[in-house]
Amino acid sequence: MAVTACQGLGFVVSLIGIAGIIAATCMDQWSTQDLYNNPVTAVFNYQGLWRSCVRESSGFTECRGYFTLLGLPAMLQAVRALMIVGIVLGAIGLLVSIFALKCIRIGSMEDSAKANMTLTSGIMFIVSGLCAIAGVSVFANMLVTNFWMSTANMYTGMGGMVQTVQTRYTFGAALFVGWVAGGLTLIGGVMMCIACRGLAPEETNYKAVSYHASGHSVAYKPGGFKASTGFGSNTKNKKIYDGGARTEDEVQSYPSKHDYV
């Protein structure tokens, strides 16, 4: 039960995280005009990964895409790449994790397969979250550097554009969305990996027990009910587990080929 809950929660947390990463990547407010000296501005500038926007006091907003690819800073390209890799890995991870969910039965998929899929998706979520956090952090670092550079009168805009003296950029909402989303995806991935441990069917090791039946000795071998002596009902044969907290029902309840959900 705890395993199912951990896996389900991990999936939901990762789903929210990946949705956040997608949202952050699409958002225009990665960097916003610094309003420290002038809280009310006639022209408000903000920039995203794909375009830069200007909002005038009339409410009119004009956005222009970065139509050049070669003219963009390498760091911006790197951030774009990290975010896209994060989204792709996260999307694949979600797809894999759907089939790995314990509450969903697909054909005669064994727990070992589900455990492997859970681990795979968990790792994908962790890498996805790390990509997003790295991307956002690289952009934030770039902003901090540019902020102080612009103060020193060295202006380089996001799209290779020359900035005017007044415009300095600070952290936009997308950075915080990205950090939180990346963190959630990472946590979701860790939860999936934890759930995987509980899902993995462990080797059922039995203590070697000697039985002195009249006439001959039979050593009971590990391997569940597969070790048979050819005698009638072994009323005294008790399975002694080294580990594992599952009931006998759980061990034996494999879905039939007609058991689809």
């Epitope: 005009q33 002038n38 009310v40 501005t41 006639a42 022209v43 500038n45 903000y46 920039q47 830069s52 926007c53 200007v54 005038e56 006091s57 009339s58 409410g59 009119f60 004009e62 222009r64 202006y155 805009g157 554009m161 020359v162 900035q163 005017t164 003296v165 007044q166 415009t167």
Partner: antibody, heavy 120, light 113 residues
Framework: QVQLQQPGAELVKPGASVKLSCKAS????????MHWVKQRPGQGLEWIGE????????NYNEKFKSKAALTVDKSSSTAYMQLSSLTSEDSAVYYC?????????????WGQGTSVTVSS | DIVMTQSPSSLSVSAGEKVTMSCKSS????????????LAWYQQKPGQPPKLLIY???TRESGVPDRFTGSGSGTDFTLTISSVQAEDLAVYYC?????????FGAGTKLELK
């Protein structure tokens, strides 16, 4: 067509207050910011401030912060500017003007202006 | 505050003449985000409110004759009237609409010779 109607003139005593009106018609009043501009006789233009009619949010020129108070009445599509503690320096023509949408922060329509004379 | 300086303060011209007036700002009016210059030109005739001629430094307002041309970028701007007509005699103001408070130049008065 867009129209901004202002009373022609106001005569007020020094130290008194006056409330100037600007009735808008021909467009959706709440969609456009309203600006107020001062012009002293034979002199240039001075921006007083602006008000967003949809939420009443104002932005003033620091110079006029203690002098002017901008308000709106959405029901009558009217913008108001109250000028307080009037002195001879406040004798001027006051214009209300609609901020254009997509024109930067230029104003495309102006009222005819209200001439305020401060005299005892 | 951004200070707008217009020159000359007055101009005496004959009908049909080409006229150029200047406007300089104490800070750049070029916005980095859209590479647009936030400067407007107004024409004011005696006893009338100002009329918008040019916005964005070079875009003519609808209905404004094409003899009026705005140019310039950053801190230096120019209004040119290619062939002055009698109805063009007025005071011309430039306005900073990039930063608050919005500021106007002192004006250039166009007079008939």
């Amino acid at each position: 067509q867009v129209q901004l109607q202002q009373p022609g003139a106001e005569l007020v005593k020094p130290g008194a207050s006056v409330k100037l009106s600007c009735k808008a018609s021909g467009y959706t009043f709440t969609r456009y910011l309203m600006h107020w501009v001062k012009q002293r006789p034979g002199q240039g233009l001075e921006w007083i401030g602006e008000i967003n009619p949809s939420n009443g949010r104002t932005n003033y020129n620091e110079k006029f912060k203690s002098k002017a108070a901008l308000t709106v009445d959405k029901s009558s599509s009217t913008a108001y500017m109250q000028l307080s503690s009037l002195t001879s320096e406040d004798s001027a023509v006051y214009y209300c003007a609609r901020l254009a949408y997509g024109y930067g922060n230029a104003v495309d329509y102006w009222g005819q202006g209200t001439s305020v004379t401060v005299s005892s | 505050d951004i200070v707008m300086t217009q020159s000359p303060s007055s101009l005496s011209v004959s009908a049909g003449e080409k006229v150029t007036m200047s406007c300089k700002s104490s800070q750049s009016l070029l916005n980095s985000g859209n590479q647009k210059n936030y400067l407007a030109w107004y024409q004011q005739k005696p006893g009338q409110p100002p009329k918008l001629l040019i916005y964005g430094a070079s875009t003519r307002e609808s209905g404004v004759p094409d003899r009026f041309t705005g140019s310039g970028s950053g801190t230096d701007f120019t209004l040119t009237i290619s062939s002055v007509q009698a109805e063009d005699l007025a005071v011309y103001y430039c306005q900073n609409d990039h930063s608050y408070p919005l500021t106007f130049g002192a004006g250039t008065k166009l007079e008939l010779k």
